[in-house]
């Protein structure tokens, strides 16, 4: 979800913007900060043995729009949050992880012996 | 036109502290991050690091962590830098800088002599 | 940090000559995002830098076009088509790419 404000191309930010990053840290970040001219974000998902795993980072400008919408994807518990209106505002994102439907259960890999 | 304007000189003591100005105009003060770069003869320019007036949240250059405290006075849009424990090794031109992914506009410097 | 070396120091030149500065990141200077922050100042004796080329090849507003600006990576270059007299002075390369921010040396551009 955007925390502030839809746009369907975005704005460039006339400066950039530190974020925290955890999980994905890119080269160029120091301390567990990096930087961007798009967006901060903290993304909660499942990891492949069920547990949540959170991470955060920055998102570049080119395709965050898209990245930030937090679009359900099928058989993949998800959810991320973005913001720009502070340096390191996704301290403050605490995403959710989507509730389970039943479907998720019945749709899972079948696993033959 | 955007200017951002410093004293001259300054002249202080060794073991005391100074702090300088920046006083920004011609633009939105907050849209952009304030930085302050060390000039010594000979020794090319360095980094000190930067603050956002929107936050006043600031990045240093690990070298001088301890030695500049950055400010900002947004009702003012003034930018400042604290020196402390000086020493003739902080004798330098110090300049501010707007900067928003890279130093667009320069002040004309603060030379700051120490000497008792 | 980010060691920034620039060649040569000093650039002995006549008016209307081609000059040409080099500068050399120790490590790659393209950045997350896909930019490259490497950029280009002049200062002249007495007064503050001035910018002239940003993000590699971009000139500034005001800035002549014999100024330009290439490169890639960790190795760039600017050129100055045809020195004027107002051109001379020290040329500095800077990367805003990793913390801390480094600058080259410096180039002294000076009539031969």
């Known amino acids: 979800k955007k925390e502030d404000g839809e746009s369907t191309a975005p704005t460039p930010r006339p400066k950039v913007l530190r974020c925290k990053c955890h999980h994905h840290c890119p080269e160029d970040s120091v301390n567990n900060i990096c930087s961007t001219d798009g967006y901060c974000f903290t993304m909660i998902e499942e990891d492949d043995s069920g547990l949540p795993v959170v991470t955060s980072g920055c998102l570049g400008l080119e395709g965050s729009d898209f990245q930030c919408r937090d679009t359900p994807i099928p058989h993949q518990r998800r959810s991320i949050e973005c913001c720009t209106e502070r340096n390191e505002c996704n301290k403050d994102l605490h995403p959710t992880l989507p509730p389970l439907k039943n479907r998720d259960f019945v749709d899972g890999p079948i696993h033959h012996r | 036109q955007v200017q951002l304007q410093q004293p001259g000189a300054d002249l202080v003591k060794p073991g005391t502290s100074v702090k300088l100005s920046c006083k920004a105009s011609?633009?939105?003060?907050?849209?952009?991050?304030m930085q302050w770069v060390k000039q010594r003869p000979g020794q090319g320019l360095e980094w000190i690091g930067e603050i956002d007036p929107s936050d006043t949240y600031t990045m240093y250059n690990q070298k001088f962590k301890g030695k500049a405290t950055l400010t900002v006075d947004t009702s003012s849009s003034t930018a400042y830098m604290q020196l402390s424990s000086l020493t003739s090794e902080d004798s330098a031109v110090y300049y501010c800088?707007?900067?928003?992914?890279?130093?667009?506009?320069w002040g004309q410097g603060t030379t700051l002599t120490v000497s008792s | 940090d980010v060691v920034m070396t620039q060649t040569p120091l000093s650039l002995p030149v006549s008016l209307g000559d081609q000059a040409s500065i080099s500068c050399r990141s120790s490590?790659?200077?393209?950045?997350?995002?896909?930019?490259?922050?490497l950029h280009w100042y002049l200062q002249k004796a007495g007064q503050s830098p001035k910018l002239l080329i940003y993000?590699?090849?971009n000139r500034f507003s005001g800035v002549p076009d014999r100024f330009s600006g290439s490169g890639s990576g960790t190795d760039f270059t600017l050129k100055i088509s045809r020195v004027e007299a107002e051109d001379l002075g020290v040329y500095f390369c800077s990367q805003s790419t990793h913390v801390p921010f480094t600058f080259g040396s410096g180039t002294k551009l000076e009539i031969k």
């Open positions: 800088a707007r900067f928003g992914y890279y130093v667009d506009y």
């Open positions: 993000k590699v090849s």
């Open positions: 490590q790659s200077l393209v950045h997350s995002t896909g930019n490259t922050y």
């Open positions: 011609g633009y939105t003060f907050t849209s952009y991050w």
